[in-house]
């Protein structure tokens, strides 16, 4: 498959398990892959009684489920871990839960960056 219109070169990166896995906790991830493959951004999170717990964000390999999605929208009804993917730089900064079966749309905005 060729590259999509919204070519993904960079994604927001996050790893809640960064200490155990000895990675950065957050930042940017540059997406690099094979010439004929598309790349995407993704986000995964938990929702415990309305409290959002971010799990992972980053680049995601060529996945037909993510094609031509400009926004990161999870559609599963009530999973243990929510997942969304999208195309376009930093498209995983915000993420949304919009169940296919209908129901309220919930959008999660990233917290404002603390002044340095």
């Amino acid at each position: 498959s060729g590259r999509g219109e919204a070519e993904t070169r960079e994604c927001i990166y996050y790893n809640a398990n960064w200490e155990l896995e000895r990675t950065n906790q957050s930042g940017l991830e540059r997406c690099e892959g094979e010439q004929d493959k598309r790349l995407h951004c993704y986000a995964s999170w938990r929702n415990s009684s309305g409290t959002i717990e971010l799990v992972k964000k980053g680049c995601w390999l060529d996945d037909f489920n993510c094609y031509d999605r400009q926004e990161c929208v999870a559609t599963e009804e009530n999973p243990q871990v929510y997942f969304c993917c999208c195309e376009g730089n930093f498209c995983n900064e915000r993420f949304t839960h919009l169940p296919e079966a209908g129901g309220p749309e919930v959008t999660y905005e990233p917290p404002p960056t603390a002044p340095t």
Partner: antibody, heavy 120, light 107 residues
């Protein structure tokens, strides 16, 4: 052609050491995470260890932690597995495998495997 | 560690049959789930990654589905070259784990 070629397997006594090597060719080695997966005779696949693109992050199965060390030399396009304090239960075919740097990190290319036999 | 359980551990089928193999994770692995095929004396081969994406060069009779804890590998019409052992693997945790395998034998 993308290729991984393991070497270094053989017969070793319990408590002994062995170093496996995996020579990579046909792709940008430093752009991929790498791993070792083993298979005991007649058994299933067991993930052993993985290493990040730069070598800065390493991961081990509980069964080998503290005894095995994974490393890589990007200038030589080579992956290593140093195995110390070997036990009979470490007897297996050891495969090296390539893993894209991005999630969900599948093992997309595998070597042919090298047999490690731990026996007195 | 995340445990991966495959069922059945073995099955007998005929050429042309539709075959379904299931894989269950002890906790959610989201879509961080890959499937491999292994023939005797050979290295494993990646079939499906990210739960449902066909790896390049793999025939379209193979398909994957599922997310969270329950996943399925389906072979729509079994071919002679498909008799092999199939493994699922989670990569949600940095400590990867494989399922125990499902051996597909000729009936």
């Amino acid at each position: 052609e993308v290729q991984l070629l393991e070497s270094g397997g053989g017969l070793v006594q319990p408590g002994g050491s062995l170093r496996l090597s995996c020579a990579a060719s046909g792709f940008a080695f430093s752009s991929y995470a790498m791993g070792w997966v083993r298979q005991a005779p007649g058994k299933g696949l067991e993930w052993v260890s993985s290493i990040s693109t730069s070598g800065g992050s390493t991961y081990y199965a509980d069964s080998v932690k503290g005894r095995f060390t994974i490393s890589r030399d990007n200038s030589k396009n080579t992956l290593y597995l140093q195995m110390n304090s070997l036990r009979a239960e470490d007897t297996a075919v050891y495969y090296c495998a390539r893993s894209p740097a991005h999630s969900p990190h599948p093992f997309d290319i595998w070597g042919q495997g090298t047999l490690v036999t731990v026996s007195s | 560690d995340i445990q991966m359980t495959q069922s059945p551990s073995s099955l007998s089928a005929s050429v042309g049959d539709r075959v379904t193999i299931t894989c269950r994770a002890s906790q959610s692995v989201s879509r961080f789930l890959n499937w491999y095929q292994q023939k005797p004396g050979k290295a494993p081969k990646l079939l499906i990654y990210a739960a449902s994406n066909l790896q390049s060069g793999v025939p379209s009779r193979f398909s994957g589905s599922g997310s969270g804890t329950d996943f399925t590998l389906t072979i729509s019409s079994l071919q002679p070259e498909d008799f092999a052992t199939y493994y699922c693997q989670q990569s949600y945790s940095s400590l990867f784990t494989f399922g125990g395998g499902t051996k597909v034998e000729i009936k």
